[in-house]
């Protein structure tokens, strides 16, 4: 018999896999739903369940999933259903892997740290290669030399400062120069070194309606790549933006709604009301998106517990173009690159 | 308001094809399914498609499976059935209807004003 | 397919009368039943949802009632505008069935 996916949190014991190998139907449609949707634990998503049919509290991480009992999306959840073989119909929500990366013709896994070479070491985070230098000689020490030279030193990675500019002297090298720089407390070498690096921020995940965008930054205390989100709503999806198109135009680019009004997030409430812009829609196959943009800080206030800010796009202009042949792929932007499809997959 | 507004009805000759269209507004089309239900001249109500929130789940009633194709765009806010093989038993006026599974399941709560298909030679 | 026979076909009343509409389901559909009014030309209109609740903005004349498979629509002191024709529709199960109306004529 099939169940009927419940609101609250879901545990399930599967069979042991030689009793049974017939996939339980966890959904049951027409849809039945029960006459109001369930209130989430702080910080739990409600969310439409995987029968696409009722509002549930999304499944964390750990937690059992099936096809009805889905895991929370908003935290990058999916159902791992490895453990369940041969049925593959109990899992367990884990954390999504992010796509590999390709650096110079070579394939690494999401997550992998590697050498490129000797200076530096690098690591792939969903598609996008962040590298921290390992060459930390800091700068000429000023204190003497006026003309200071990067020299290659046989048998070591890492060029040296030597300086030229005192016959009197001789050459001193990066280990001398290192101890007398580092010895008038000018420069902390680690972070002097620190390759600034952010990565742009990717689609939003939903050409409609809440979703999420990341990118890559390493501009952190510990100049360590670091994946941010924030959240983004390219138009809301419950307005039809055709309808405000004027007469003989085929675009709206932008569309703003006439009043302000608050942000919601899992049942929490933004602390002030917003009057967003939106990006529009064209009646041919041209699409909108951002072009000028920021993130703001938005504060929620939930109705039970504490309240907490998140990252949010806000969009100032949008532009309609022919470039986007499938506006839900969150990579196509990345198809213009090389070895894009090496990434993709 | 919420709203359903469907196009798309012509004369088309049997073996013919068809694409109906379903706008809808006022509402948050992609949190319900969308049905398609007919009505034959002089006749009754019948059932012919159904489509889940995001397309992952279909079904079609066993008249018209296989020669009609029920599909959406959440982006666009549009209900669509593509319509193969027509024959004069498909006449009739085309609904569009907003399945309720709001709050329980409660068959439909909101329908189009219909558009004619008419089916001769 | 679970097949809905309605009774009567037609009906015949005046405004005031109390009339009363039948839907008989071929299997039971517990209270996963609607009852639609349509006029000549209109879109059909949900009077009656779950068997038994009043859909929002329907006037109070109209009630439900039954389980499983037998279930009844009243309406009790017609006015001009119910003239029309019923249906009920059973969404327990696919296919979606609706009965064969009744169509409900002034006297």
């Known amino acids: 018999t099939a169940l009927s996916p419940t609101p609250t949190t879901m545990t399930f014991t599967p069979a042991p896999l030689e009793e049974t190998t017939t996939r339980p139907e966890f959904c049951k449609w027409p849809c039945e739903c029960p006459q109001s949707p369930p209130r989430c634990p702080l910080g739990v998503s409600l969310i439409t369940d995987g029968c696409e049919c009722c509002k549930i509290c999304a499944q964390q991480l750990g937690d059992n999933c099936t096809e009805a009992a889905i895991c929370d999306p908003h935290r990058g959840l999916y159902c791992d259903y490895s453990g369940d073989r041969p049925r593959y119909a109990i899992g367990v929500c884990a954390q999504v892997v992010g796509v590999g990366c390709v650096l110079d013709g070579v394939r690494y896994t999401n997550g992998e740290s590697f050498q490129p070479n000797c200076r530096y070491n690098c690591t792939c985070i969903d598609g996008t290669v962040g590298c921290t230098p390992l060459c930390l000689s800091p700068r000429p020490p000023r204190l003497w030399c006026r003309q200071p030279r990067h020299v290659r030193v046989p048998g070591q990675c890492c060029e040296q400062w030597v300086c030229d500019d005192d016959a009197r002297r001789p050459r001193q090298t990066a280990l001398l120069d290192t101890r007398a720089f580092a010895a008038s407390g000018a420069v902390e070498q680690r972070y002097e070194n620190c390759i600034a690096y952010t990565s742009p921020w990717s689609p939003c995940s939903t050409t409609c309606g809440l979703g999420i965008s990341t990118r890559i930054s390493n501009v952190n205390a510990r100049c360590w790549p670091e994946q941010e989100s924030r959240l983004c709503n390219l138009r809301p999806c419950d307005v039809d933006i055709q309808l405000h198109i004027k007469a003989g135009k085929k675009c709206l680019a932008v569309y703003q709604p006439e009043e302000a009004t608050n942000f919601t997030l899992a049942g929490c409430v933004s602390t002030r009301t917003y009057r967003p812009k939106y990006c529009g829609v064209c009646t041919d196959n041209r699409c909108c998106i951002p072009y000028k943009s920021k993130t703001i800080s938005v504060d929620f206030q939930c109705p039970e517990g504490p309240g907490f800010s998140r990252q949010v796009l806000w969009i100032n202009a949008c532009f309609c173009n022919l470039s986007c042949r499938n506006p839900n792929d969150i990579f196509a932007d990345l198809e213009s690159y090389p070895d894009f499809e090496e990434i993709a997959n | 308001q919420v709203q359903l507004v469907e196009s798309g009805g012509a004369l088309v000759q049997p073996g013919g094809s068809l694409r109906l269209s379903c706008a809808a507004s006022?509402?948050?089309?992609?949190?319900?399914?969308l049905s398609w239900v007919r009505q034959a001249p002089g006749k009754g109500l019948e059932w012919v498609s159904s489509?889940?929130?995001?397309?992952?789940?279909?079904h079609y009633a066993d008249s018209v499976k296989g020669r009609f194709t029920i599909s959406r765009d959440n982006a666009k806010n549009s209900l669509y059935l593509q319509m193969n093989s027509l024959s004069a038993e498909d006449t009739a006026v085309y609904y569009c209807?907003?399945?309720?599974?709001?709050?329980?399941?409660?068959?439909?709560?909101?329908w189009g004003q219909g558009t004619m298909v008419t089916v001769s030679s | 397919a679970i097949q809905l026979t309605q009774s009567p076909s037609s009906l015949s009343a005046s405004v005031g009368d109390r009339v009363t509409i039948t839907c008989r389901a071929s299997?039971?559909?517990?209270?996963?039943l609607g009852w639609y009014q349509q006029k000549p030309g209109k879109a059909p209109k949900r009077l009656i949802y779950?068997?038994?609740s009043l859909q929002s903005g329907v006037p109070s004349r109209f009630s439900g009632s039954g389980s499983g498979t037998e279930f009844t629509l009243t309406i009790s002191g017609l006015q001009p505008e119910d003239f029309a024709t019923y249906y009920c529709?059973?969404?327990?199960?696919?296919?979606?069935?609706f009965g064969q109306g009744t169509r409900l004529e002034i006297k």
């Open positions: 209807a907003r399945e309720d599974t709001s709050m329980a399941t409660n068959g439909f709560d909101v």
């Open positions: 006022g509402f948050t089309f992609s949190d319900h399914w």
């Open positions: 489509i889940s929130s995001s397309s992952r789940y279909i």
């Open positions: 299997q039971g559909i517990r209270n996963h």
């Open positions: 779950a068997a038994s």
């Open positions: 529709l059973q969404h327990n199960s696919y296919p979606f069935t």
